[in-house]
Amino acid sequence: LIIGFGISGRHSITVTTVASAGNIGEDGILSCTFEPDIKLSDIVIQWLKEGVLGLVHEFKEGKDELSEQDEMFRGRTAVFADQVIVGNASLRLKNVQLTDAGTYKCYIITSKGKGNANLEYKTGAFSMPEVNVDYNASSETLRCEAPRWFPQPTVVWASQVDQGANFSEVSNTSFELNSENVTMKVVSVLYNVTINNTYSCMIENDIAKATGDIKVTESEIKRRSHLQLLNSKAS
């Protein structure tokens, strides 16, 4: 969390941002809140990006003001116009690009004063893994697949029964470049698995950590997966 305060002159207002990550090709949110004003027409929101001289987005007098927008953000940004009055200056960023990563500033002017706060925005690709029993293999084998990751992640297998065991010798991980030539499909195979055990395939890069679990018993197979974004700090 980053909390910024205003500058000299008028009173300062508190502006709060939260560091976040965007998934390439999907929509993302750059979070920013501020002390609300009673009059929408008195609120100005400017989003800026370090190293970019045009604006990312501007909202003033109750509507978007895009004459100064940098072309790299053209047609891809929107504020939640109906929530500005309650102090929400968050920016929706459509079709996140790798180059959108960087330091952004949320700058607010209201009748009460001015304020700003920075946020770090990371971009990459992350997806939920799915673990399945590979019935085509000669021995009991598990196959963990996740369709989109970037940068290249690490893959670690773990087991509930053999806690702390190193499975690197009995696993094989491959990365296949996807058609857009940025993200990669992750495939990891674990050999010599035993039944009545829960195995976890953990995929991690500097943006996200995802885990796919599979519990194999004689009578059933249970799966569970979850994904967690790393370094979500507020400012």
């Epitope: 190293g51 045009g54 927008q69």
Partner: antibody, heavy 116, light 107 residues
Framework: EVQLQQSGPELVKPGASVKMSCKAS????????MNWVKQSHGKSLEWIGR????????SYNQKFKGKATLTVDKSLSAAYMQLNSLTSEDSAVYYC?????????WGQGTTLTVSS | DIQMTQTTSSLSASLGDRVTISCRAS??????LNWYQQKPDGTVKLLIY???RLHSGVPSRFSGSGSGTDYSLTISNLEQEDIATYFC?????????FGGGTKLEIK
């Protein structure tokens, strides 16, 4: 008052290189992109590319990649364009102009003549 | 690249006339259309940006309009000092591109 002062006319031989300058005053140099635009005799305007004076980052028109190199010197508030392997096709007036979506202030132009 | 077309390359008008110069883009440019004036000595000035916004110091007789792919510049009361060539430019997508220009002359 915003001013962009460009270097004087150049007469150079084919195959040579030339470096022209654009000195900015009346505003904070690092706050605005600097564009370069070509105008061949009696013709329209062609955008060559632009440079970000705050970090030296450049964007080029594909047509001028390898022909033009854009640089800045922050300490002098000056932008430069080098043109290499010159031919008669490069004879033109070259303008610098600041800002991104709508170049709002333009230099007076530098006339380049390529002739043996 | 986005092509910008000014169909009229030269235009004759009388002082006091209302003159309209048009410009067409090969695709929607979302109002990112600018107009420039180039005097015979080569001096280039921005007149209108973002379709209809008057640049500082530009006389109010100049106005701009349009949307999508079709845009125009209007001079409401032509003066001698308006004799120049007028260029449109799209600022929507790199590379920025210009129209071929419209040369305005006095009848």
């Amino acid at each position: 008052e915003v001013q962009l002062q460009q270097s004087g006319p150049e007469l150079v031989k084919p195959g040579a290189s030339v470096k022209m300058s654009c000195k900015a005053s009346g505003y904070t140099f690092t706050d605005y992109y600097m564009n370069w635009v070509k105008q061949s005799h009696g013709k329209s305007l062609e955008w060559i590319g632009r440079v970000n004076p705050s970090n030296g980052g450049t964007s080029y028109n594909q047509k001028f990649k390898g022909k033009a190199t854009l640089t800045v010197d922050k300490s002098l508030s000056a932008a430069y364009m080098q043109l290499n392997s010159l031919t008669s096709e490069d004879s033109a007036v070259y303008y610098c102009a600041r800002r991104h979506n709508y170049p709002d202030y333009w230099g007076q132009g530098t006339t380049l003549t390529v002739s043996s | 690249d986005i092509q910008m077309t000014q169909t009229t390359s030269s235009l004759s008008a009388s002082l006091g006339d209302r003159v309209t110069i048009s410009c067409r883009a090969s695709q929607d440019i979302s109002f990112y259309l600018n107009w420039y004036q180039q005097k015979p000595d080569g001096t280039v000035k921005l007149l209108i940006y973002y379709t209809s916004r008057l640049h500082s110091g530009v006389p109010s007789r100049f106005s701009g309009s349009g949307s999508g792919t079709d845009y125009s510049l209007t001079i409401s009361n032509l003066e001698q000092e308006d004799i120049a060539t007028y260029f449109c430019q799209q600022g929507n997508t790199l590379p920025w591109t210009f129209g071929g220009g419209t040369k305005l002359e006095i009848k």
